[in-house]
């Protein structure tokens, strides 16, 4: 007959207040005849948690049916865990005897400690928008977890980031801990649709990490490129000039036309389109009247994007004599 071994596989068991804790214990032999008991602590002051033989333990249930002869599983569940339940729990085999049962063998013990789940990570981006090729900082915070060991990772669109710094406070013993991490992210022009993810893994989460996200659309400003072009065809005595504002973000945009330095109110039409990368294109059409025989019309398309300094593009209108003739012919 194999010598009895008491197996308690977990050295440490982290539990949450109010939840049920399962303490595992298996034996390798049914001999000697006698009960298995659970204690918290060691020595004369140890506290009886469960006695297979007798007693009433309202918060304790057995995992297996101890009335089955071939049962070798003496694991127990303790319900409604409170901070008072922390300590080291021992599964102990006794040999039937008198006047008392005789302690035969003890398991190595399982330390039960209170674990607290981290709060959902909150990711905060920069206060102001930044243009591509620049670096922005994102912070991630999570609080209230225990024990102190925690893993935090940063991702940008699923790719793990390496440029970040993390602190867990306090450094000494505490009931609960907080983590704060700052990641530095280089912005790309296509990052409007990008996300940064802060992922927190903790023993209390049972392999299901918590994630916090931030959209780079909140942090990026993609400045527009401008192009002003004159349409080759004219409509009566008018020439159509187009200002194309390309690849900008966010949508906030003011466009004004100037003719020889004078701001004009007339804008024939405009369209806003969204690109696949989340940036926008804006096209504005301006009709220039060429009936008054001027040769030196300079048009300026000025764009103020997201409160930044205005950028402009100029176009010197080319009006041929033939066009002038056509226009005067067309005028009654």
């Amino acid at each position: 007959e194999e010598e009895l071994q008491m197996i308690q596989p977990e050295k440490l068991l982290l539990v949450t207040v109010g939840k049920t804790a399962t303490l595992h214990c298996t034996v390798t032999s049914l001999l000697p005849v006698g009960p298995v008991l659970w204690f918290r602590g060691v020595g004369p002051g140890r506290e009886l948690i469960y006695n297979q033989k007798e007693g009433h333990f309202p918060r304790v249930t057995t995992v297996s049916d101890l009335t089955k002869r071939n049962n070798m599983d003496f694991s127990i569940r303790i319900s409604s865990i409170t901070p008072a339940d922390v300590g080291t729990y021992y599964c102990v085999k006794f040999r039937k005897g008198s006047p008392e049962d005789v302690e035969f063998k003890s398991g190595p013990g399982t330390e039960m400690a209170l674990g607290a789940k981290p709060s959902a990570p909150v990711v905060l981006g920069p206060a102001a928008r930044t243009t591509p090729e620049h670096t922005v900082s994102f912070t991630c915070e999570s609080h209230g977890f225990s024990p102190r060991d925690i893993t935090l990772k940063w991702f940008k669109n699923g790719n793990e980031l390496s440029d970040f710094q993390t602190n867990v406070d306090p450094t000494g013993q505490s009931v609960a801990y907080s983590i704060r991490s700052t990641a530095r992210v280089v912005l790309d022009p296509w990052d409007v649709r990008s996300q940064v993810i802060c992922e927190v893994a903790h023993v209390t989460l049972q392999g299901d990490p918590l994630r916090g996200t931030a959209n780079l659309s909140e942090a990026i400003r993609v400045p527009p490129t401008l192009e002003v072009t004159q349409q080759p065809m004219r409509v009566g005595n008018q020439v159509n000039v187009t200002c194309q504002v390309r690849k900008f973000y966010p949508q906030s945009l003011q466009l004004t036309w100037s003719e020889n330095g004078n701001v004009c109110q007339r804008e024939t039409a405009s369209t806003l389109t969204e690109n696949k990368d989340g940036t926008y294109n804006w096209t504005s059409w301006f009709l220039v009247n060429i009936s008054d025989q001027r040769d030196d019309v300079v048009l300026t398309c000025q764009v103020k994007h997201d409160g930044q300094l205005a950028v402009s593009k100029r176009l010197a209108l080319e009006v041929t004599v033939h066009q002038k003739d056509q226009s005067s012919d067309a005028t009654p």
Partner: antibody
Framework: EVQLVESGGGLVQPGGSLRLSCAAS????????MHWVRQAPGKGLEWVSA???????YYTGSVKGRFTISRENAKNSLYLQMNSLRAADTAVYYC????????????WGQGTMVTVSS | DIQMTQSPSSLSASVGDRVTITCRAS??????AAWFQQKPGKAPKSLIY???SLHSGVPSKFSGSGSGTDFTLTISSLQPEDFATYYC?????????FGQGTKLEIK
């Protein structure tokens, strides 16, 4: 259903031998401590013998050296070989199963009568 | 060997009565005391183990108590089917021994 059925009892002369059998059903006999208990006519209960799960055997003083307890796992059966029988051995013999962890008797057979008389 | 002494050896009672049978061990047996019920011509039936635990299917009118050397079996409200002979037993060490029995009769 968990059941124990004894057989093999009968009338035997003093000095004779008898082998009692106990067929177990509904459980694996080798996983339990098993016992024989007897009751002489009009008398109380007397524990006779036991066999542990490890094959260890125990006897009451009056039968030591004369009785042998054994089991056959393949047949899920318990036996009591009784030699050098005496009139004082006359009794109903019960096969009894010991409890799960403390060997408390839980299941009893219906008994088989052994009469030792000339 | 450990001696188990039961008292009384016989007891008359009426239906509905509460009765107590006692058993004393010649030395401490922890709480490895069991109680059995036997009716004439039948095999004994297991009632109680480890002094106070009821076997499966045993009605709660049966209760046991005690530890060390003194043990009791109580039947809270006698019914006609409870009139039988009751035995105590120690099973802490071999040879296991029984009390001489208490015959419970209808008054």
């Amino acid at each position: 259903e968990v059941q124990l059925v004894e057989s093999g009892g009968g009338l035997v002369q003093p000095g004779g031998s008898l082998r009692l059998s106990c067929a177990a059903s509904g459980f694996t006999l080798s996983s339990y401590d098993m016992h024989w208990v007897r009751q002489a006519p009009g008398k109380g209960l007397e524990w006779v013998s036991a066999i542990g799960t490890a094959g260890d055997t125990y006897y009451t003083g009056s039968v030591k050296g004369r009785f042998t307890i054994s089991r056959e796992n393949a047949k899920n059966s318990l036996y009591l070989q009784m030699n050098s029988l005496r009139a004082a051995d006359t009794a109903v013999y019960y096969c009894v199963r010991g409890g799960v962890w403390d060997d408390a008797f839980d299941i009893w057979g219906q008994g088989t009568m052994v009469t030792v008389s000339s | 060997d450990i001696q188990m002494t039961q008292s009384p050896s016989s007891l008359s009672a009426s239906v509905g009565d509460r009765v107590t049978i006692t058993c004393r061990a010649s030395q401490g047996i922890n709480n490895y005391a069991a109680w059995f019920q036997q009716k004439p011509g039948k095999a004994p039936k297991s009632l109680i183990y480890t002094a106070s635990s009821l076997h499966s299917g045993v009605p709660s009118k049966f209760s046991g108590s005690g530890s060390g050397t003194d043990f009791t079996l109580t039947i809270s409200s006698l019914q006609p089917e409870d009139f039988a002979t009751y035995y105590c037993q120690q099973y802490v060490s071999y040879p296991y021994t029984f009390g001489q029995g208490t015959k419970l009769e209808i008054k």
